[in-house]
């Protein structure tokens, strides 16, 4: 497959917001590539999110996805948004050389991202 | 207009070698991994080699059907691919297709094996 | 290695029907699932590419759908012309193991 490189651990902030690099060895010009996002959890494979973008142009995500990205070469910058304790998984980055044939697919090993849902502020008198 | 045009193939000896040549022309040949694929009426079709291109370091990865009797190896400056294929057998014969990985297809060559 | 089980082996339908072969895998290979058209004599085609995506020039007809270990390849409307022997492919990693092909007569 493809190579596919991604952080080990992230960490969410505590809005709930995780940023991870996907970057991926191209072996030609691909012109159309989509990026998947899919979280991994108790061997099930759920996706998170999807973008297809033309090379030199922005990645845009469905208006109600969590996910938001940029693009600059090979590198795809991923934020995930609205995460809470319960979202803690794996986060593997999935990438596919669409157009011009051939088809390349390249899969990385994940990220883990941990959220934290934070303290709730105690009242005050 | 994409073209891969195998050659090479022929009867050969079991235990003799021979060495297929793919020429591709009508795409960035240095661009792509080059694969070779048999095609048998007993196995259908198989994969047999892959070879990588420049960013890949050349990588090359095999069945473990032809793994230490066939090489793949590429010319990118003559947008060829080759397959030696040493030490045959009977379950070697086969039409033997070249491909840019998987996408665009050879006619093929025919290798028999035969005594 | 990954292993591919495909079904039918063979299957005969009438023009104007609907058929669908399928292929699973021994394990969740990502959608990176190919799948081609062998006719007699000719050299296999691509048809899906990435479990869901149609080759170009190829029939629109033909539709891929399926992800993590399960897969399947509808052909719509058959045609005389779709006579051919289908295959699917892994293309996640190597091996690139093809499945044992769907004979199809119409």
């Known amino acids: 497959a493809m190579h596919v490189a991604q952080p080990a651990v992230v960490l969410a902030s505590s809005r709930g917001i995780a940023s991870f690099v996907c970057e991926y060895a191209s072996p030609g010009k691909a012109t159309e590539v989509r990026v998947t996002v899919l979280r991994q959890a108790d061997s099930q494979v759920t996706e998170v999110c999807a973008a297809t973008y033309m090379m030199g142009n922005e990645l845009t995500f469905l208006d109600d996805s969590i996910c938001t990205g940029t693009s600059s070469g090979n590198q795809v910058n991923l934020t995930i948004q609205g995460l809470r304790a319960m979202d803690t998984g794996l986060y593997i980055c999935k990438v596919e050389l669409m157009y011009p044939p051939p088809y390349y697919l390249g899969i990385g090993n994940g990220t883990q991202i941990y959220v934290i849902d934070p303290e709730p502020c105690p009242d005050s008198d | 207009e994409v073209k891969l045009d195998e050659t090479g193939g022929g009867l050969v000896q079991p235990g003799r070698p021979i060495k297929l040549s793919c020429v591709a022309s009508?795409?960035?040949?240095?661009?792509?991994?080059m694969n070779w694929v048999r095609q048998s009426p007993e196995k259908g079709l198989e994969w047999l080699a892959q070879?990588?291109?420049?960013?890949?370091?050349?990588?090359?990865y095999y069945s473990d059907s032809v793994k230490g009797r066939f090489t793949i190896s590429r010319d990118d400056s003559k947008s060829s691919v080759y397959l030696q294929m040493n030490n045959l057998r009977g379950e070697d014969m086969g039409i033997y297709y070249c491909?840019?990985?998987?996408?665009?297809w050879g006619q093929g060559t025919l290798v028999t094996v035969s005594a | 290695d990954i292993q591919m089980t495909q079904s039918p082996a063979s299957l005969s339908a009438s023009v104007g029907e609907t058929v669908t072969i399928t292929c699973g895998t021994s394990?969740?290979?990502?959608?990176?699932l190919n799948w081609y058209q062998r006719k007699q004599g000719k050299s296999p085609q691509l048809l899906i590419f990435?479990?869901?995506n149609l080759a170009d020039g190829m029939s629109s007809r033909f539709s891929g759908s399926g992800s993590g270990r399960q897969y399947s390849l509808k052909i719509s409307s058959l045609h005389p012309d779709d006579v051919a022997t289908y295959y699917c492919?892994?293309?996640?990693?190597?091996?690139?193991?093809f499945g044992s092909g769907t004979k199809l007569e119409i």
């Open positions: 990435g479990a869901t």
């Open positions: 492919q892994n293309v996640l990693r190597s091996p690139f193991t």
């Open positions: 009508g795409f960035t040949f240095s661009d792509n991994w």
């Open positions: 491909t840019a990985q998987f996408a665009y």
């Open positions: 070879i990588r291109n420049k960013p890949y370091n050349y990588e090359t």
């Open positions: 394990e969740n290979i990502y959608g990176g």
